[in-house]
Amino acid sequence: PEPPTACREKQYLINSQCCSLCQPGQKLVSDCTEFTETECLPCGESEFLDTWNRETHCHQHKYCDPNLGLRVQQKGTSETDTICTCEEGWHCTSEACESCVLHRSCSPGFGVKQIATGVSDTICEPCPVGFFSNVSSAFEKCHPWTSCETKDLVVQQAGTNKTDVVCGPQDRLRA
């Protein structure tokens, strides 16, 4: 028969022959022959391959270096890599999460729109009119100004995006 020029899914072409790829979690030891199936071997401890492959070496699991603020979020298997995340109060600098930086805080006049996670930084937003933030924080949202009216008080000093209003007693009208 004519030697193949293309192979089925999960196969590869070598020396005019279609050989089965090794399944995830296994590496190639020896190509198939007309008489013998592809020889594959499971990846060792701390190694993985996550696709059907013809790799002769498994990949090393990622190391979550505590010196870089990293910790293991999900332990790797023979078919998956280790997933790293950052220690509390830190977040990854990239999608690959190779190092961590401290969450940023929102300055006075800004509040937290979205609290940081292990993979994303704090998202701040300016406090709109009627709201303020007088602290630098990675957790505090903008607070609404105090409503003097509900306390039967009057505004003595207008609020800003960084300060609350100051309420005071109403002036009594003399008869």
């Epitope: 020396n15 022959t33 008489f35 013998t36 020889e39």
Partner: antibody, heavy 117, light 109 residues
């Protein structure tokens, strides 16, 4: 450990038959092609026959074609060589060997076949 | 049929010396499918080199293979006492038959 052990050799008269066996252990026998290779006393290696892992493909050396039959029983992890119409020139040590794309990587210790009247 | 011719037939050397064994094919052989075997008296052959130049598992690095096309070489850089044996080349690219060379005997001088 990975091992091949041949048996069934002996002294036989010309024209008679003999069946050799090769018992495999320590590996997935049903995934590998298997060969028979022989060596006449004081001579070199001569390839005899090969069978594919599931038994569908078989090839023979011209010197044994039509007289020898290679077969396998994967449920018993055993390879066979049925030798009919034996001749004096078939006298040899018969080895079974495992097929890979790297050559014959595992060999048995051999079994001696002597064809003599 | 590819015929493999090995030379010399016998090589007489002393331990520590370098051995160079030749295997010539009657037509071009894919180097992916050229192997070398070692055989000691009363023992089965042992795979030494496959793919013309790759050492099999557990084979010491004093053994090396080279060559392509029709000319292949097995080199033993420094002969150890246990290396005195018969060496066979084999092609398994073009079959049937899978052919062996006639062998080279490496003997102690």
């Amino acid at each position: 450990q990975v091992q091949l052990v041949e048996s069934g050799g002996g002294v036989v008269q010309p024209g008679r038959s003999l069946r050799l066996s090769c018992a495999a252990s320590g590996f997935t026998f049903s995934s590998y092609g298997m060969h028979w290779v022989r060596q006449a006393p004081g001579k070199g290696l001569e390839w005899v026959a090969v069978i594919s892992y599931e038994g569908s493909n078989k090839y023979y050396a011209d010197s044994v074609k039509g007289r020898f039959t290679i077969s396998r029983d994967n449920s018993k992890n055993t390879l066979y060589l049925q030798m009919n119409s034996l001749r004096a020139e078939d006298t040899a040590v018969y080895y079974c060997a495992r097929d890979t794309s790297r050559g014959h990587d595992i060999w048995g210790q051999g079994t001696m076949v002597t064809v003599s009247s | 049929e590819i015929v493999l011719t090995q030379s010399p037939g016998t090589l007489s050397l002393s331990p520590g010396e370098r051995a160079t064994l030749s295997c010539r094919a009657s037509q071009s052989v894919s180097s992916s499918y050229l192997a070398w075997y070692q055989q000691k008296p009363g023992q089965a052959p042992r795979l030494l080199i496959y793919g013309a130049s790759s050492r099999a598992t557990g084979i010491p690095d004093r053994f090396s293979g080279s060559g392509s096309g029709t000319d292949f070489t097995l080199t033993i850089s420094r002969l150890e006492p246990e290396d005195f044996a018969v060496y066979y080349c084999q092609q398994y690219a073009d079959y049937p038959p899978f052919t062996f060379g006639g062998g080279t005997k490496v003997e102690i001088k």
